[in-house]
């Protein structure tokens, strides 16, 4: 059974992930971002279901395409280089989902824009955090 300390750690990691995803979304939605139109043409894949930490596998698998799209944006829109930002997210995701179980992600048929993709994972983080508090 999860201890209060492990629950607290999970909550902090989720909050960190949430902040990183929100920072990316804010950088993209920044009214000064001339790349928004181009960024919105890129397709992202969404999980059929995302209710548990193991479903973060679906986020992990789309981090490289996310980095590619962020490479289009001026680095001043973000505090970190896309490579460093995605690397940080990857570390948190790996810790949260755990490496013991191998989960095969199932994707929805419809693709999403980067904004829809980020909003979906922001909602996921918020939902899990609310169950922990």
């Amino acid at each position: 059974a999860p201890t209060s300390s492990s629950t607290k750690k999970t909550q902090l990691q989720l909050e960190h992930l949430l902040l990183d995803l929100q920072m990316i979304l804010n950088g993209i939605n920044n009214y000064k971002n001339p790349k928004l139109t181009r960024m919105l043409t890129f397709k992202f894949y969404m999980p059929k279901k995302a209710t548990e930490l193991k479903h973060l596998q679906c986020l992990e698998e789309e981090l490289k395409p996310l980095e590619e799209v962020l490479n289009l944006a001026q680095s001043k829109n973000f505090h970190l280089r896309p490579r460093d930002l995605i690397s940080n997210i990857n570390v948190i995701v790996l810790e949260l989902k755990g490496s013991e179980t191998t989960f095969m992600c199932e994707y929805a048929d419809e693709t999403a824009t980067i904004v829809e993709f980020l909003n979906r994972w922001i909602t996921f983080c918020q939902s899990i955090i609310s169950t922990l508090t």
């Epitope: 181009r38 992202f44 894949y45 698998e61 490289k64 395409p65 590619e68």
Partner: antibody, heavy 121, light 113 residues
């Protein structure tokens, strides 16, 4: 028809610079990134970098960071690459290229005919 | 950067033969979301620009003869040319475009025996 028309061959002395052009037709240059690729027969193909003509933003492969400067002029629907501090190693054919569609930056489907740059004293 | 190891370096063939060119990447090029491998194959003839033959590892570019077949997934890829024609004599390159910077294989020269 989508075409990328490049400038003619160039002969340069070591230490000098050269500016190559790539004029796009059949589409609006601001809709796609323009990539530049180097071909040396003994080294194959190497990606140099890209420019987004819409706002002039660029990305370079690390080894070309201080060698190449990419620019674009939307009014003439053209992209340019300046190569500085030329050495005989820069002798190569340089290509500009565009991706297959706008939903992803690669692969390169449309290519210019190439510009041969020869660096010799 | 992803390293693309292409083999063989050169290949001498007779017309009508079948040839295979291999490309191995240092990391997987498969995107799970769409089950596509971000790998392309190019043909380059002397004095010409490279021509896109195959993208997403196995999708033939419009107008490319169907004797050019791309296969493979993950890290191992193959370009097969069945019934080689004289006009197929050229250099062939693989390109990964999964992770920036995009990187090419060293190339394979297809020559006539």
């Amino acid at each position: 028809e989508i075409q990328l028309q490049q400038s003619g061959p160039e002969l340069r002395r070591p230490g000098s610079s050269v500016k190559l052009s790539c004029k796009a037709s059949g589409y609006n240059i601001t809709d796609y990134l323009i990539h530049w690729v180097r071909h040396r027969p003994e080294h194959g193909l190497e990606w140099i970098g890209w420019i987004d003509p819409e706002d002039g933003e660029t990305r370079y492969a690390q080894k070309f960071q201080s060698k190449a400067t990419l620019t674009a002029d939307t009014s003439s629907n053209a992209a340019y690459m300046q190569l500085s501090s030329l050495t005989p190693e820069d002798t190569a054919t340089y290509f500009c290229a565009r991706s297959l569609d706008s939903t992803y930056n690669y692969p390169f489907a449309y290519w210019g005919q190439g510009t041969l740059v020869t660096v010799s004293s | 950067d992803i390293v693309m190891t292409q083999s063989p370096f050169s290949l001498a063939v007779s017309e009508g033969e079948m040839v295979t060119i291999n490309c191995k990447s240092s990391q997987s090029l498969l995107r799970s979301g769409n089950q596509k491998n971000y790998l392309a194959w190019y043909q380059q003839k002397p004095g010409q620009s490279p021509k896109l033959l195959i993208y997403y590892a196995s999708t033939g570019q419009s107008g490319v003869p169907d004797r050019f077949i791309g296969s493979g997934s993950g890290t191992d890829f193959t370009l097969t040319i069945s019934d080689v024609q004289a006009e197929d004599l050229a250099d062939y390159y693989c390109l990964q475009h999964w992770i920036s910077p995009p990187t090419f294989g060293a190339g394979t020269k297809l020559e006539l025996k």
